[in-house]
Interface confidence: medium
């Protein structure tokens, strides 16, 4: 709205940098062939690039990425009894970010 | 995968708490009737509840919310010239979070 402006602070741009985000661990990451199980924990923290850039045609992109394997529980329910197994999920953390030029989409030929 | 487990740390649940997120200021928040303008900054930081809960049937929800008005620039392009105006956008910050019971979905009658 273009209403009362007196108490409003100037909005500060959310700069392009890494922030802590919540990543949901989908079952497909662990087993694409079977859906009869649960994953624990269901979500973890990851570092991801986010924010805006000062110019158009640029986007906040990671310039350095690190893969981080973590152990989760794969809980299969078999005949009303849980079977716990360890599974490894590889998370992607962004270590550094940059406002990078977005390559123009190539025309379809 | 259930592959090599040696270097993987146990995954820690992303607990239910406030985290800094990037909120995109859409033009609709400022003027629903006109699309012929830009907003600056295009995005800002807000505090939002995120994460997972230890139990079933509960969700991470805000228990305390604060509205925060901020000033943005509304940049209208009139005859190829920019006209700057001030606009106020009200952001919503989450101050506290809790894992709250999700009410069972009512059956459609």
């Amino acid at each position: 709205s273009l209403g009362s402006l007196t108490i409003a602070e100037p909005a500060m741009i959310a700069e392009c940098k890494t922030r802590t985000e919540v990543f949901e661990i989908s079952r497909r990451l662990i087993d694409r062939t079977n859906a009869n199980f649960l994953v624990w924990p269901p979500c973890v923290e990851v570092q991801r690039c986010s924010g805006c850039c000062n110019n158009r045609n640029v986007q906040c992109r990671p310039t350095q990425v690190q893969l981080r394997p973590v152990q989760v529980r794969k809980i299969e329910i078999v005949r009303k009894k849980p079977i716990f197994k360890k599974a490894t999920v590889t998370l992607e953390d962004h270590l550094a970010c940059k406002c990078e030029t977005v390559a123009a989409a190539r025309p379809v030929t | 995968s259930l592959g090599s487990l040696t270097i993987a740390e146990p995954a820690m649940i992303a607990e239910c708490k406030t985290r800094t997120e990037v909120f995109e200021i859409s033009r609709r928040l400022i003027d629903r009737t006109n699309a012929n303008f830009l907003v600056w900054p295009p995005c800002v930081e807000v505090q939002r509840c995120s994460g997972c809960c230890n139990n079933r049937n509960v969700q991470c929800r805000p228990t305390q919310v604060q509205l925060r008005p901020v000033q943005v620039r509304k940049i209208e392009i009139v005859r190829k010239k920019p006209i700057f105006k001030k606009a106020t956008v009200t952001l919503e910050d989450h101050l506290a979070c809790k894992c709250e019971t999700v009410a069972a979905a009512r059956p459609v009658t």
Partner: antibody, heavy 120, light 106 residues
Amino acid sequence: EVQLLESGGGLVQPGGSLRLSCAASGFTFSSYAMSWVRQAPGKGLEWVSYISDDGSLKYYADSVKGRFTISRDNSKNTLYLQMNSLRAEDTAVYYCAKHPYWYGGQLDLWGQGTLVTVSS
Amino acid sequence: SYELTQPPSVSVSPGQTASITCSGDSLGSYFVHWYQQKPGQSPVLVIYDDSNRPSGIPERFSGSNSGNTATLTISGTQAMDEADYYCSAFTHNSDVFGGGTKLTVL
């Protein structure tokens, strides 16, 4: 204060029955799986039985299968262990313990235990 | 049925490092927890999910688990650490405890 308080132990003859109770307080009982663990005099810990948050999953150690029944009343914040056909080797301190998740996991809170003695 | 094997006793001098092992077939495929029990008291969780410490447990307690062996390590052992220690793992529909290790601080 978060705590578990067992009761119902005592002296019983072989072949007899006992019902143990575990009253939970200080946490949302209905959200967590629970277990019974026992310890014979001078011996180690032995897991006895488990029940999930809503009671839909239950399982037992082979040594008690068919004789013991675990149950819970979430409205009363209470866990139970019905013990039938008791044997001398069931003599032990019985602990109720809480898991941190609905499905199980480690045992992060233990009661003080109640002694069951099976003897003629 | 699955078995977890622990040494019956381990001795350590104050200030030294104590290591208690727990072995079982492919134990590294399961999450291992460790419990401390002092005479006349209920067990207390000291390590969960192989290597995590619950709040309130001193930093000198640590754990690892790979292959067929899990290890509880107590660095800078204190007299107050003298107790029985039990490993535990959830395997094949049942919680299994090791036989326990009596830690003596000389």
